[in-house]
């Protein structure tokens, strides 16, 4: 065509796949009458008529564009819907009068690829490979045009490097005309790359500008020989008996060698292999002081049969031995003194505490508890706690019962019990003393005795309420070798006029007696022996 070399560059129209391209015929009125225009698509320099405009009315020509073209803007613009990659070509409009002129439009089509999918080489890479090995593959699907790929290691872009880095990219065209890009990164890796993060980046263009998408970061298994093995103990810090302790072998090679853990026999000085779990971990649960000792780990490379030995590690399981208290079962008179001595062994410095068992009160900080001018109330439990202050939770205790000789001491002397005739009454009577008293009742019934502690006894009596019983009342008598003591239970009939018993009485029906009153400890400092009996 004469003068074609002087044709201006076509107007560029950019559009995304699936959207509508607006092809505006740029002929001026002088160049042609827009009410009489032919539209052509140009593919491989071949023109194909695709649309006619006559008297401002448009008509599609049969063919691939038949259903997708329409006229807009009073005939000046041709709209192409559902744009595909195959639509990337030149479109031209040709005016017929006054003379034949044409206007060219270059349609550029774009489609963002999907998120890049990265797959690491699952087999891993040995560090001593002679040539670059496949590290990972990056796939970017359904993009248009073909996106560019950039590989990164630890955030830095990788460039082709002879015998070290090679990037091999290929693409396939889908039936949709979209491209799928596949890029394989090959590299020679070193031991330090075991933690390296690799990812790929797809660079592509849209009508709005340049864009990029990044894959997730991956690490590749890197195989390298073991140079060193060592032991690791968990938990870190001071260990104590009862802890769960894990001893594991570690190596700086990948894959790790076959491990075995040995402990030195203190008698023979020989290393004896310990039994580990399926993960090669020696679990000491609960740890005991006997677990203390020298441990070492052997790593055997099953390929090369090279064996490596760790530095030995001393394990100390801190302990507190059984606590011994002397005297073990002290019996003392009122007014006498008692020295309780606590002993224990430990792998660390021990702290001793004496506590009153009943109250938890700390009486002494130290192994020796001295009790002077003992009163009956001093009888009971004393607990020695041997603890290691530097290791929280490491302690052992021993309870010792101090018996103070004395006749029976009644929990109450007198009590009123409200009853109904012919009911079965459950009465209780409590006494303490040393030797421990026995309790007898002055009425027939089913009695049972329960030892509350070494100095205290509780007797329970089930008895039928009869007129005779109401008259006589009930007495319980506690006795030991040092004396006798009696508690009296007055039985009173409940009747309609009995509303609230006076505040000094204890009410009760079928299970009548409330728990016995407790006697407050004497704080008297009078210089005399205690009362001969306590009547509750």
């Amino acid at each position: 065509v004469p003068g074609e070399a002087e044709q201006p560059a076509p107007e560029l129209v950019e559009v995304e796949v699936g959207s509508t391209a607006l092809l505006k015929c740029g002929l001026s009125q002088s160049q042609g009458n827009l009410s009489h225009v032919d539209w052509f698509s140009v593919h491989k320099e071949k023109r194909t008529l695709i649309f006619r405009v006559r008297q401002g009315q448009g008509q599609s020509e049969p063919g691939e564009y038949e259903q997708r073209l329409s006229l807009q803007d009073r005939g000046a613009t041709l709209a192409l819907t559902q744009v595909t990659p195959q639509d990337e070509r030149i479109f031209l409009c040709q005016g017929k009068r006054p003379r034949s002129q044409e206007y060219r439009i270059q349609l550029r089509v774009y489609k963002a690829p999907e998120e890049p999918n990265i797959q690491v080489n699952p087999l891993g890479i040995p560090v001593n490979s002679k040539e670059p090995e496949e590290v990972a593959t990056c796939v970017g699907r359904n993009g248009y045009p073909i996106p560019q790929v950039i590989w990164y290691k630890n955030g830095r872009p990788l460039k082709e490097e002879k015998n070290r880095v090679h990037i091999q990219s290929s693409q396939t065209v889908e039936s949709s005309g979209l491209y799928t890009l596949q890029s394989i990164l090959k590299a020679q890796l070193v031991k330090e790359d075991k933690d390296a993060q690799f990812y790929c980046e797809l660079n592509y263009r849209l009508p709005s500008g340049n864009h990029m998408k990044e894959s997730r970061e991956v690490t590749v298994p890197v195989f390298y020989p073991t140079e060193k093995v060592w032991l690791e103990v968990e938990p870190v810090g001071m260990l104590k008996e009862g802890d769960r302790v894990e001893i594991r072998c570690l190596a700086d090679g990948n894959p790790p060698p076959h491990f075995s853990i040995s402990k030195q026999n203190p008698s023979t000085r020989e290393a004896e292999e310990e039994t580990t779990n399926d993960n090669g971990v020696l679990v000491l649960e609960p740890a005991r002081k006997e677990h203390s000792g020298r441990y070492e780990c052997q790593g055997l490379d099953l390929d090369t049969m090279i064996s490596l030995l760790s530095e030995p590690q001393e394990l100390l399981v801190n302990y507190v031995s059984d606590v011994r208290v002397s005297p073990a079962a002290p019996e003392r008179q009122e007014g006498s003194s008692l020295t309780l001595t606590c002993e224990a062994e430990s792998s660390q410095d021990l702290e001793f505490q004496w506590l009153r068992e009943e109250t938890g009160q700390v009486l002494e900080r130290g192994p020796v508890l001295q009790l002077h001018d003992l009163k009956r109330e001093a009888g009971g439990g004393y607990r020695c706690v041997a603890s290691v202050p530097s290791i929280p939770g490491l302690n052992r205790t021993q309870l010792v019962n101090v018996a103070i000789f004395g006749p029976p001491w009644m929990a109450f002397k007198e009590r009123k019990v409200w009853v109904k005739e012919n009911m079965v009454l459950n009465l209780s009577c409590e006494a303490s003393g040393h030797p421990r008293p026995t309790i007898s009742w002055n009425v027939n019934g089913t009695a049972s005795e329960q030892d509350q502690d070494p100095q205290r006894v509780l007797s329970t009596l089930n008895v039928l309420v009869t007129p005779e019983l109401l008259e006589t009342g009930v007495e319980c008598t506690a006795s030991n070798d040092l004396g006798k003591n009696t508690s009296i239970l007055f039985l009173e009939l409940v009747n309609l006029t009995t509303l609230t018993p006076d505040s000094n009485t204890t009410t009760g029906l079928s299970t009548s007696t409330a728990s016995p009153h407790t006697r407050a400890n004497s704080t008297s400092t009078e210089r005399k022996l205690p009362e001969p009996e306590s009547r509750g």
């Epitope: 008179q333 007014g335 006498s336 001018d373 003992l374 040092l482 001969p532």
Partner: antibody, heavy 119, light 109 residues
Framework: QVQLVESGGSLVQPGGSLRLSCEAS????????MSWVRQAPGKGLEWVSI????????SYADSVKGRFTISRDSSKNMLYLQMNSLRAEDTAVYYC????????????WGQGTLVTVSS | FMLTQDPAVSVALGQTVRITCQGD??????ASWYQQKPGQSPVLVIY???NRPSGIPDRFSGSSSGNTASLTITGAQAEDEADYYC?????????????FGTGTKLTVL
């Protein structure tokens, strides 16, 4: 074995003073209350005084209260009875006795020492 | 307070004899019993409910009822001839006092 040996008995004038001693051996002295018991010639036994194992508590029969003082030295395993303002009716053999429980009984007795109050 | 004993009791050799002791304190405390032979120190023979110190023959036994304590010798022997004293804590005072019984002279015939 348990042994109690009294000493210090003698003839003393009325109104005079005397100190009796009792040496204990064969047991943990500080763990036991100790008593003095006396027996006038041809008469029965009469309890005189008691002291607790620690020495912190004492008690006396009405007949000697205010005149006699009981004490002990556990470091020396010794029991003492300081007798002041002695009277003729204090004449007796004085025994020291160990109290088994602090509540009775007297399970070991010394051989006794004679105190005579006479002008 | 007082613990009262019979001044004298006699028993035929091999027979059983009971020596009694009465007093209010015996409602709360058991009596202890002591044997004293002429020129000797007293010896504990029974204490508590019915306990014998080692070395005391089992013919000696004790019992208690109400305000009365008893020492029983079953099959009395000649060597049992002695003075016998009961002893108890005083339950009337607010601090410990001990009291001895008046004593019983046992003669074995």
């Amino acid at each position: 074995q348990v042994q109690l040996v009294e000493s210090g008995g003698s003839l003393v004038q009325p109104g005079g003073s005397l100190r009796l001693s009792c040496e204990a051996s064969g047991f943990t002295f500080s763990s036991y209350a100790m008593s003095w018991v006396r027996q006038a010639p041809g008469k029965g036994l009469e309890w005189v005084s008691i002291i607790s194992g620690s020495g912190g508590s004492t008690s006396y029969a009405d007949s000697v209260k205010g005149r006699f003082t009981i004490s002990r030295d556990s470091s020396k395993n010794m029991l003492y009875l300081q007798m002041n303002s002695l009277r003729a009716e204090d004449t007796a053999v004085y025994y020291c006795a160990r109290d088994k429980y602090g509540y009775n009984p007297f399970d070991y007795w010394g051989q006794g020492t004679l105190v005579t109050v006479s002008s | 307070f007082m613990l009262t004993q019979d001044p004298a009791v006699s028993v035929a050799l091999g027979q059983t004899v009971r020596i009694t002791c009465q007093g209010d304190s015996l409602r709360s405390y058991y009596a202890s019993w002591y044997q004293q032979k002429p020129g000797q120190s007293p010896v504990l023979v029974i204490y508590g409910k019915n306990n014998r110190p080692s070395g005391i023959p089992d013919r000696f036994s004790g019992s208690s009822s109400g305000n009365t304590a008893s020492l029983t010798i079953t099959g009395a022997q000649a060597e049992d001839e002695a003075d016998y004293y009961c002893n108890s804590r005083d339950s009337s005072g607010n601090h410990p006092l001990y009291v001895f019984g008046t004593g019983t002279k046992l003669t074995v015939l």
